[in-house]
């Protein structure tokens, strides 16, 4: 994993300016686990930044990610109705620069070195789960979310007419 | 147009059963988390009861005050959302909101105009 | 239980002027770097109404005169220029654990 202590130091001046012509209602820096405490980590590996679920050695430090909240100003196509109501979407980024993307072709998730305005891959639709847990859907893709597979983030297609196990999409935001 | 309409309220005695429906309409009910809120007569407001997704297992919570006597289910097929209440004492009587939490779960954004509970002798 | 009490019970403000109502939690409503802090608007014979979500922003259609503030444990919902459409009572409510709990209501009146 590597180091992020320079994310506290970017994140005010980073977003002093907006992102998407509107400013982000609030920002948190949290680590990123997954339902079952495995931690989500980054690694420059050829010059590109590889995300990772591992297990954490003892006292080895969580990498942190800056989660920069938005209100959504249309409701999701998944949401079947115009009157859904304002939708929290979520941007995630572990070091200056990079965000977290959808590939939806390869159903993967990539980080991206990206401009403002972001690309609407950089954006998620934040779900409330109990457990304290959240998922995070694609903006560009209702219905699908990040998920965990083979030690990897990966997009999921999630079904509400399948009985998915849906602990591999549930994530914990931990300040410490 | 989106809709939450109640129905199966009326006068019970106490330590009797009533199973309430709500029957939604205007939007994919399968997609929403669904909630049972309710308001004695003059009182305030006091939520119930809460049904998941199929994903999440339909997993239901419940306010301690009707745990062990309420039951809250879904028919999706039926775009229908249920709260079967037994062993109804006099303090149940209550104006009952069959309510949808907004897509992400962050709040109740449509609620049912409500169905009357009345529980005496 | 986290219980949520408001204060006044009851408020009489003048039309266009400000109405200003707190709503206290015993603990800490905070998850995820925000407040799980709603505010409803109910009427008389109306089933309640989204007006603000996590503590402050505002709901869809919810005109610009509502506004809510706060964290963590004290929260306000403001009402800039009262309007006589705005008789009703105003309840919080934290969504934060379960069981989800409401405060006892403020109501508001014309003086």
């Known amino acids: 994993a590597f180091g992020i202590s320079g994310v506290q130091k970017y994140t005010r001046a980073l977003h002093d300016s907006s992102i998407t012509g509107i400013s982000p209602i609030t920002e948190y820096l949290a680590s990123l686990s997954t339902y079952n405490d495995q931690s989500i980590t980054f690694a420059l590996e050829d010059e590109s930044y590889e995300i990772y679920v591992e297990d954490l050695k003892k006292d080895e430090k969580k990498d942190k990610v800056l989660l920069s909240y938005y209100e959504s100003q249309h409701p999701s196509n998944e949401s079947g109705d115009g009157v859904d109501g304002k939708m929290l979407m979520v941007t995630l980024s572990p070091t200056k620069d990079f965000w977290l993307h959808a590939n939806n072709k390869e159903h993967s998730v990539e980080l991206h070195k990206c401009e403002k305005p972001l690309p609407d891959q950089a954006f998620f639709v934040l779900h409330n789960m109990h457990s304290n847990c959240v998922s995070f859907e694609c903006k560009t893709d209702p219905g699908v979310f990040i998920g965990v597979k083979d030690n990897h983030l990966a997009l999921i297609k999630v079904d509400s007419s399948e009985n998915l196990c849906t602990e591999n999409i549930l994530f914990k935001l931990s300040e410490t | 147009e989106v809709q939450l309409v109640e129905s199966g309220g009326g006068l019970v005695q106490p330590g009797g059963s009533l199973r309430l429906s709500c029957a939604a309409s205007?939007?994919?009910?399968?997609?929403?988390?669904m909630n049972w809120v309710r308001q004695a007569p003059g009182k305030g407001l006091e939520w119930m009861a809460e049904?998941?997704?199929?994903?999440?297992?339909?997993?239901?919570h419940y306010a301690e005050s009707v745990k062990g006597r309420f039951t809250i289910s879904r028919d999706n097929s039926k775009n229908t959302v249920y709260l079967q209440m037994n062993s109804l004492r006099a303090e149940d009587t209550a104006v009952y909101y069959c309510?949808?939490?907004?897509?992400?779960?962050?709040?109740?954004?449509?609620w049912g105009q409500g169905t009357l509970v009345t529980v005496s002798s | 239980d986290i219980v949520m009490t408001q204060s006044p019970d009851s408020l009489a403000v003048s039309l266009g002027e400000r109405a200003t109502i707190n709503c206290r939690a015993s603990?800490?409503?905070?998850?995820?770097?925000?407040?799980?802090l709603n505010w409803y608007q109910q009427k008389p014979g109306q089933p309640p109404k989204l007006l603000i979500f996590?503590?402050?922003s505002q709901g869809s259609g919810v005109p610009d005169r509502f506004s809510g503030s706060g964290s963590g444990t004290d929260f306000t919902l403001t009402i800039s220029s009262l309007q006589a459409e705005d008789v009703a009572v105003y309840y919080c409510?934290?969504?934060?654990?379960?069981?989800?709990?409401f405060g006892q209501g403020t109501k508001v009146e014309i003086k």
């Open positions: 309510a949808r939490r907004n897509y992400g779960n962050w709040y109740i954004n449509v």
């Open positions: 205007g939007f994919t009910f399968s997609n929403y988390w």
């Open positions: 049904i998941t997704l199929k994903f999440n297992n339909y997993s239901t």
């Open positions: 603990e800490s409503v905070d998850k995820f770097g925000m407040s799980f």
């Open positions: 996590v503590a402050s």
């Open positions: 409510q934290q969504s934060k654990d379960i069981p989800y709990t």
